[in-house]
Interface confidence: low
């Protein structure tokens, strides 16, 4: 028998330095956690220990922070580089620069090979990105060799930025004549490597023949065996055991996310590849394991060139800002309400006295905030800060919608509701009631807008046939988070301002904030 | 098996509105995009636009807009095409195409309806 | 629009004989490129998708080759069964647009 141990992270999200436990900036350094010098520390520990070790990372590390904020991802380069990662998997958020974004500061940059066998490059791009990324990698480990084969959600041309000339195949037709390949190169023993969710995941594990684990990404999964050490629930034990359709039981894991749990997985394969057991659990990155030295001292001499960002007060919080994923992607959250608040703020326009304003409503994708504020940090908000909460670098843009398409959207908003998905909508100016115990697209039982051809501003249904302007991100303008309709029915869309000036705007012009959750959502009785 | 059944035969009169429909079975409906293909009598086929059965989005040829409108109903798993102000020029076999892929984004339109006539007459 | 040159418009051969017919678009497609089959009354039948790429259950005398602008069809041994209208489409851009046809008889 032969023993691999396998290390992953998975959707770190820009997090180079420490953070607090729910992945927003560190306040009290005792308590942080996570950070790639943290990382590099369990890591080298891991990897004097045991003979045959595999660093792997399986996407998203781009986005996040104000790291890639200014660096633009040559960050992900040198620190990857630094931690000497064995592959990585291309996540949809390294798309989120362009090809070009991927291109300089990553794929050129990189010592590790860096995977996707889903993705398909055409036209002239084809020759330009050839050989920076690979459908699979064999890695010798030891005396043996181990194949790598990568996979990116198909869903990428939908969430980020890839342009026209990358086709994004089904992942699992897309990987079943690469595994083949490894077979018939007598490598034996093979990874898939991957970021389209923990439900991809499980099919790749039942459907690719060949395939031996399963390391993924993209849903932020948690799974842990045992008493979790952290606020994190478990979505099943670590690893997940899928049963192939051709009988094999295959190991499935995914690390939570931001750099907080280093995956830990140890896989005894015979010698024939077959793995004979499998076991392991994500580890908490505490502060009980130390930062590394050299790393962290590097990690500050980098940090230097993010301090103009970082350290002017825009205003004060006296309330936290709950942008959390378990709060926005599944109810009102006051980050939500802030966010839109300074959208319209920002569009304030009195040009006709027929209006109080040209525009009074707002939708924002809840998948868009990224992260909470914590008040506690003597309420200071800082641009750094709101990097982490929208750190797209999209803009917030003005278009004209029917009635009927807004209705499409908020139908759409809730057409999965309870999967944790982004396109759940935050609102301003909106006032919506969802019954959850309707089949999907008929869940609006209301949907009332603030007038804004009146002296006073009220609510008033929602009418079909009128057009509206609406407030949005240009993300949602642009079809993201399946919001097709309206990218398809837009009757006009300007492009507006930077996202993170409007709330850094609003938020020093008002000095000090206190948004508060305020029945903007709701939902009807015996749904919720 | 894989099955897109169309509806009858249309005879109607200029100026008047007409909607067909393309009943899929076989497949999740949701999951392919459903484009719509006209012919007319002895010439060759032209494109009118889609519809994705999973959101609702459509797309048009610029030559068919405002006279295609593409809606879909999940329930029945029934894509249609109702198409306004006919006049002769409309007289054609109207054919419903799934956008069917092999590796994801491989594309083709590999089943079709077997086609609705409809003829505008006074 | 991209526009689709279809050649020849129509043309006899005998059974046995190898056919090609092509196909030029006025820009380059990137061999996003479908050809169809059609009989007198019937609905479109799809043989080849992505320029090369047989659909399954369509006989292998069937082929397509071609990248760029130009495109072909090949009949490696023609059949009775082969007799009808082919189609070219293009889907690399917006609007989709087909070939006027091609109507193959029998010599």
């Known amino acids: 028998a032969w023993e691999l141990t396998i290390l992953h992270t998975n959707d770190v999200h820009s997090r180079l330095e420490q953070t607090s436990e729910d992945s927003s900036k560190c306040v009290n350094a005792s308590r942080c956690m996570g950070g790639v010098a943290r990382l590099f520390t369990k890591v080298q520990q891991i990897r004097r220990a045991e003979p045959n070790v595999l660093l792997l990372d399986a996407g998203d590390q781009y986005q996040g922070t104000i790291w890639f904020t200014v660096y633009k991802g040559a960050e992900v380069a040198h620190f990857m580089n630094a931690l000497r990662y064995d592959a990585m998997a291309l996540g949809n958020h390294e798309f989120d620069n362009g090809v070009e974004g991927l291109i300089e500061p990553l794929l050129k940059e990189a010592k590790f090979p860096i995977l996707s066998a889903n993705i398909k490059a055409k036209g002239p791009l084809a020759s330009q990105i050839s050989g920076l990324y690979l459908p699979y990698k064999v890695l010798p480990v030891g005396d043996e060799v181990v194949g790598i084969v990568g996979y990116t959600s198909k869903e990428t041309p939908f969430l980020s930025n890839p342009g026209t000339n990358l086709v994004f195949e089904d992942e699992i037709t897309a990987l079943q004549p690469e595994v083949d390949k490894l077979k018939t190169l007598n490598v034996n023993k093979i990874i898939a490597l991957g970021h389209s969710g923990f439900e991809m995941d499980k099919l790749i594990a039942q459907k690719v023949r060949g395939v031996d684990v399963v390391v993924g990404g993209h849903s932020n999964t948690f799974l842990y065996t045992g008493n979790p050490p952290s606020k994190e629930v478990p979505a099943g034990k670590y690893p997940f055991i899928v049963t192939s359709d051709d009988g094999r039981k295959v190991p499935v894991v995914q690390a939570y996310a931001f750099g907080k749990y280093l995956g830990y997985l140890k896989i005894e394969f015979d010698e024939r590849g077959n793995v004979i057991s499998s076991h392991g659990n994500p580890i908490l990155l505490n502060s009980s394991i130390p930062e590394d030295p050299s790393i962290k001292a590097d990690i500050n001499k980098w940090r230097i060139k993010l301090d103009n960002y970082s350290t002017q007060e825009l205003g004060k919080t006296i309330v936290y800002l709950d942008g959390s994923s378990q709060s926005c992607r599944f109810r009102e959250c006051n980050m939500g309400n802030l966010i839109c608040d300074a959208m319209i703020n920002n569009n304030l326009r009195h040009t006709d006295e027929m209006f109080w304003n040209h525009v009074s409503m707002c939708i924002l994708n809840g998948g868009g905030i990224r992260s909470p504020i914590d008040e506690r940090n003597n309420g200071t908000i800082t641009w750094e800060n709101l990097a982490a909460v929208l750190p797209f670098g999209g803009t917030f843009d003005l278009v004209q919608l029917k009635g009927s398409t807004l209705k499409k959207a908020f139908e759409h908003s809730v057409h999965r509701y309870g999967q944790s998905t982004g396109e759940f909508l935050q609102v301003g100016g909106i006032h919506v009631v969802y019954d959850l115990s309707r089949k999907p697209g008929d869940r609006v039982v209301k949907l009332d807008v603030l007038c804004t051809k009146c002296r006073v501003p009220s609510y008033d249904p929602l009418k079909m046939d009128e057009v509206y302007k609406v407030i949005l991100p240009n993300f949602l303008a642009n079809g993201g988070d399946g919001f097709q309709m309206i990218k398809d029915e837009l009757l006009r869309h300007d492009s507006g301002d930077q996202d993170i000036n409007v709330v850094s705007t609003y938020i020093s012009k008002m000095k000090v904030i206190y948004p508060a959750v305020e029945g903007r959502i709701k939902f009807s009785t015996g749904s919720h | 098996e894989v099955q897109l059944q169309q509806s009858g035969p249309e005879l109607v009169k200029p100026g008047a509105s007409v909607k067909m429909s393309c009943k899929a079975s076989g497949y999740t409906f949701t999951s392919y995009v459903m484009h719509w293909v006209k012919q007319k009598p002895g010439q060759g086929l032209e494109w009118i636009g889609y519809i994705n059965p999973y959101n609702d989005g459509t797309k048009y040829n610029e030559k068919f807009k405002g006279k295609a409108t593409l809606t879909s109903d999940k329930s029945s798993s029934t894509a249609y095409m109702e198409l306004s102000s006919l006049t002769s020029e409309d007289s054609a076999v109207y054919y419903c195409?799934?956008?069917?892929?092999?590796?994801?984004?491989?594309?083709?339109?590999?089943?079709w309806g077997q086609g609705t006539s409809v003829t505008v007459s006074s | 629009d991209i526009v689709m040159t279809q050649s020849p418009s129509s043309m006899y051969a005998s059974l046995g004989e190898r056919v090609t017919i092509t196909c030029k678009a006025s820009?380059?497609?990137?061999?996003?490129l479908s050809w169809f089959q059609q009989k007198p009354g019937k609905s479109p039948k799809t043989l080849i998708y992505r320029a090369n790429r047989l659909v399954d259950g369509v006989p292998s005398r069937f082929s397509g080759s071609g990248s760029g602008q130009d495109y072909s069809l090949t009949i490696s041994s023609l059949e009775y069964e082969d007799m009808g209208i082919y189609y070219c489409l293009q889907y690399d851009e917006f609007p989709l647009t087909f070939g006027a046809g091609t109507k193959l008889e029998l010599k």
């Open positions: 195409a799934r956008w069917g892929y092999d590796e994801g984004y491989y594309y083709a339109m590999d089943y």
């Open positions: 820009q380059d497609i990137n061999s996003y």
